[in-house]
């Protein structure tokens, strides 16, 4: 049983090898099987891995860039997750999230189809505020610290990729 599980894991790791030649793995429990991995130099939080892409690209190119690495633009599900993410961000930069409003009717959608929950959003005050600005970024405002803002999707920004940990 343990052998077949290991074989499965190895074949899964091979899929990642093209873009992630090196993995950082940690033991999650006492059992030898309880380890999880993130590509090096991605950071890990709970069951996910995160990568800050510092190249300035449009939202579409940023999402493409993440998907090529087996990830998506980041979907933020909790305040704790956002608090972890911002530790690795620069205050003078903005970063695309995996959040957009395709119809321009303020029906926001996450790239992975996670339901948009109004109660777990971190918009800056007064945001979102423009119907033709249909992509979301996270940035720092001295008055409110880190929060979200709507911007034009074609404006190049840095971005954050997120993927499930490799078990």
């Amino acid at each position: 049983f343990m052998y077949s599980k290991t074989v499965k894991r190895l074949s899964k790791l091979r899929e990642y090898q093209q873009y992630h030649p090196s993995l950082t793995c940690v033991m999650e429990g006492k059992d030898i099987e309880d380890w999880s991995c993130c590509p090096t130099p991605w950071t890990s939080f709970q069951s996910s891995c995160y990568f800050i892409s510092t190249g300035m690209q449009s939202w579409t190119k940023s999402q493409k860039n993440c998907s090529v690495m087996g990830a998506d633009l980041v979907v933020i599900n909790t305040r704790e997750e956002q608090d972890f993410i911002i530790q690795n961000l620069k205050r003078n930069s903005s970063y695309f999230l995996g959040l957009s409003d395709p119809g321009g009717r303020r029906h926001w959608q996450w790239v992975d189809q996670t339901p948009y929950n109004e109660n777990v959003t971190f918009w800056h005050s007064g945001e979102p505020n423009n119907l033709d600005e249909r992509c979301a970024i996270i940035n720092f405002r001295s008055s409110e610290e880190w929060g979200w803002n709507d911007i034009h999707c074609h404006v190049p920004q840095k971005s954050i990729c997120k993927m499930k940990k490799i078990y």
Epitope: S58, T60, K61, P102, G104, N129, D132, C153, H154
Partner: antibody, heavy 123, light 111 residues
Framework: EVQLVESGGGLVKPGGSLRLSCAAS????????MSWVRQAPGKGLEWVAY????????YYPDSVKGRFTISRDNAKNSLYLQMNSLRAEDTAVYYC????????????????WGQGTLVTVSS | DIVMTQSPDSLAVSLGERATINCKSS??????????MNWYQQKPGQPPKLLIY???TLESGVPSRFSGSGSGTDFTLTISSLQAEDVATYYC?????????FGGGTKVEIK
């Protein structure tokens, strides 16, 4: 009927300033991102600036950044371009254009253009 | 910046004949099967007029003899049967990523 009418062009010396205006009518001006695009005599089209519908966000190419400022007054249905430190290479017809978004707002086209106003920078 | 290269620079076509203009972008302007490619027509002394957006969607009121095709980095504007009123300069444009950039233009004349 959508109409965009530019004004304010003219002859100005190098280093001088000029303020262009674009009066919009026939649509809800405050709902649209707007651009300025220029065309040097006998040349192609070059984007100069755009401003979001609410006026909070503005963008420029490197060629004009720090010298040109785009602004708008939604109450007056007007778009402006303040041009400072003008150079001979800024000589062009300046058009204002409306953005129309498609494919879920990822992209846009400039669906309406004004007739343009000529700016000549020469000593 | 994304560079848009149009060819040819000019084109002379007989009335009723087909005119084809090409536009190549320095990098892909697609996402999820959609393209951020637009085509404009500019007649002498007039502002540009939007003909086609999203690579192949005809703007309202534009005659059906105009069509657009292509994806990725290679796009084409076709006038199936050239009319006298089609004499103009045609420009491609991408709006995938700022700054929005235009091709150098293709001048279409009657042979």
């Amino acid at each position: 009927e959508v109409q965009l009418v530019e004004s304010g062009g003219g002859l100005v010396k190098p280093g001088g300033s000029l303020r262009l205006s674009c009066a919009a009518s026939g649509f809800t001006f405050s709902s649209y991102t707007m651009s300025w695009v220029r065309q040097a005599p006998g040349k192609g089209l070059e984007w100069v600036a755009y401003i979001s519908s609410g006026g909070g966000n503005t963008y420029y190419p490197d060629s004009v950044k720090g010298r040109f400022t785009i602004s708008r007054d939604n109450a007056k249905n007007s778009l402006y371009l303040q041009m400072n430190s003008l150079r001979a290479e800024d000589t062009a017809v300046y058009y204002c254009a409306r953005h129309d978004y498609y494919d879920g707002g990822l992209y846009y086209a400039m669906d309406y253009w004004g007739q343009g106003t000529l700016v000549t920078v020469s000593s | 910046d994304i560079v848009m290269t149009q060819s040819p620079d000019s084109l002379a076509v007989s009335l009723g004949e087909r005119a084809t203009i090409n536009c190549k972008s320095s990098q892909s302007v697609d996402y999820d099967g959609d393209s951020s490619m637009n085509w404009y027509q500019q007649k002498p002394g007039q502002p540009p007029k939007l003909l086609i957006y999203a690579a192949s969607t005809l703007e309202s009121g534009v005659p059906s003899r105009f069509s657009g095709s292509g994806s990725g980095t290679d796009f084409t504007l076709t006038i199936s049967s050239l009319q006298a009123e089609d004499v103009a300069t045609y420009y491609c444009q991408q709006t995938n990523e700022d700054p929005p950039t235009f091709g150098g233009g293709t001048k279409v004349e009657i042979k």
